[in-house]
Interface confidence: low
């Protein structure tokens, strides 16, 4: 009956962690004697190829300084402890502790048997590192030039993480990769870049980080912060201002970051009706007269700059009873 070595084609281990390289001789065959078990690295320099051996009586030995006896152990193999106990070498699973990048490569598990001869199996050990992810907004001021408004950083991954962004904005990503502080790892930084405008302020974008160590992609929401001058509109004019009307109000509606620091009401004609009283963002009209046949201007200032809106007023002789709809500035 033929025997075979059961190994995994590939094993993944976490950088700095412990990994087991399974190796079993199957099936159990009565009378088959295992004289020696060895682990080798066929791709390593000659003096480092023999990694570990297990002798039925002498037990384990680890000839190579890399990885070395302090980082290697056999999980289940047992040596003979006396005449009445047999060595158990069918399971030659090897544990490798404190994984380093240099540990990555091919490992061959070999059983020297009698009478069947040597049989072997090969496993590829991959060393991976789970990256640590963070994302943050960059406080920026509006401009005409593309600017980084958010950063997403995946630190010290192996292999490098894949970063993408989920957003409905018009953006592009710029990625850089640098070596991590842990040897063999990579820190990936993705810069979410756009022309910063008020439209982007307060918008949440999502950084998506994919890595083979994750069960599912990491999704990190980031709320953008763009400082921009006031965007102004005027509401309250309903196209039915008539002489003597007393309940009219104009409102200066503003979107800005940061908040407005001042409102200024004026007219394009330079004449400001005395019955119009500015109260911050509102212009309260006590009584409409012919001086209101003008264009009102609301100018709003914040720490970034200023914005303005105009509203043309047409004063009627009498109320319009046709039911006009409200119109904005």
């Amino acid at each position: 009956q033929d025997v075979r070595v059961q190994v995994l084609p590939e094993v993944r281990g976490q950088l700095g962690g412990t990994v087991e390289l399974p190796c079993h001789l199957l099936p159990p065959v009565p009378g088959l004697y295992i004289s020696l078990v060895t682990w080798q690295r066929p791709d390593a320099p000659a003096n480092h190829q023999n990694v570990a051996a297990f002798h039925p009586k002498m037990g384990p030995s680890f000839p190579s300084p890399k990885p070395g006896s302090e980082r290697l152990s056999f999980v289940s193999a047992k040596q003979s402890t006396g005449q009445d106990t047999e060595a158990e070498l069918q399971d030659a699973t090897l544990a490798l502790h404190g994984l380093t990048v240099e540990d990555e490569g091919n490992y061959t598990c070999e059983f020297a048997t009698f009478p069947k001869g040597s049989v072997r199996g090969m496993t590829w050990l991959r060393v991976i590192a789970k990256p640590k992810n963070q994302a943050e907004a960059q406080k920026v001021t509006f401009s005409q030039d593309p600017t980084t408004v958010a950063l997403c950083i995946s630190k010290e991954g192996r292999p490098p993480a894949r970063i993408s962004w989920l957003s409905s904005l018009d953006w592009e990503a710029k990625e850089t990769q640098v070596s991590g502080t842990l040897a063999g790892t990579v820190t990936v930084t993705s810069r979410f870049t756009l022309v910063p405008s008020g439209r982007a302020d307060g918008v949440t974008v999502t950084c998506k980080v994919e890595h083979e160590s994750f069960e599912e992609p990491a999704l990190i929401p980031v709320t953008l912060s763009v400082r921009y001058p006031p965007e102004v509109s005027i509401s309250g004019y309903d196209d039915n201002w008539y002489l003597g009307r007393t309940d009219a109000t104009l409102s200066c509606d503003v979107r800005s970051n940061p908040e407005p620091t001042g409102y200024d009401w004026s007219t394009t004609s330079g004449t400001f009706p005395t019955s119009a009283v500015a109260q911050g963002s509102q212009l309260v009209i006590h009584a409409v007269d012919s001086l209101f046949n003008t264009t009102f201007v609301c100018t709003v200032t914040n720490a970034v700059g200023m914005g303005r809106a105009e509203q043309v007023i047409f004063v009627r002789e009498t109320p319009n009873t046709a039911g006009a709809g409200a119109t904005g500035g």
Epitope: T204, T206, P221
Partner: antibody, heavy 116, light 107 residues
């Protein structure tokens, strides 16, 4: 941080309906399923159903089909669970919970008592 | 519906003991099993997801294992603060179902 804040305790008559709300904050409301789980006094947990606020898709435990309606209001980041034709065995603490990989965030629970 | 059968229903152990709770699914659920801890007056908290993955912030004395139909939650060294009810839950098939719970007490 993620928070799920549920509405207050309710006492209802048999045959009536109850609507429990769950206001979410601290994450993208439309990106995660919100589930509802109940727990009768001194008993185990029972999954009722779920809603995906991104498209208002809902999914119910057959046991409650026809009696339960789970909805979400994207504008207020609030999920609702309405249970009708109440009976005494519906007395329980009702939880809303956010599904990521598992139920990783929970509301504080809403006690619903059905009594004549 | 998939039945999740937990055992034991009640468990009494001493501080420092290794504690094991098992959960059997009535049909194959892969590794789509979570474990929760619930203390009186509180909602449940996730301990383990995907059968063996420890949730963020969960002490490493908690571990999970299993796949298919048989699953285990292990507390390697019981602490006084671990007194609670523990639930398994499958999320492989709709409807999601929970085990009936295991009440863990300190001797």
């Amino acid at each position: 941080q993620v928070q799920l804040v549920q509405s207050g305790a309710e006492v209802k008559k048999p045959g009536s309906s109850v609507k429990v709300s769950c206001k979410a904050s601290g994450y993208i409301f439309t990106s995660y399923w919100i589930h509802w789980v109940r727990q009768p006094p001194g008993k185990g947990l029972e999954w009722i159903g779920a809603v995906y606020p991104g498209n208002s898709d809902s999914n119910y435990n057959q046991k409650f089909q026809g009696r339960v309606t789970i909805t979400a209001d994207e504008s207020t980041s609030t999920a609702y669970m309405e249970l009708s034709s109440l009976r005494s065995e519906d007395t329980a603490v009702y939880y809303c919970t956010k599904l990521v990989g598992t139920f990783d965030y929970w509301g504080q629970g809403t006690t619903v008592t059905v009594s004549s | 519906d998939i039945q999740m059968t937990q055992s034991p229903s009640t468990l009494s152990a001493s501080v420092g003991d290794r504690v094991t709770i098992t959960c059997r699914a009535s049909q194959n659920v892969g590794i789509n099993v979570a474990w929760y801890q619930q203390k009186p007056g509180q909602p449940p908290k996730t301990l383990i997801y995907s059968a063996s993955y420890r949730y963020s912030g969960v002490p490493d004395r908690f571990s999970g294992s299993g796949s298919g139909t048989d699953f285990t939650l292990t507390i390697s060294s019981l602490q006084a603060e671990d007194v609670a009810v523990y639930y398994c839950q499958q999320y492989n098939t709709n409807p999601f179902t929970f085990g009936q719970g295991t009440k863990l007490e300190i001797k």
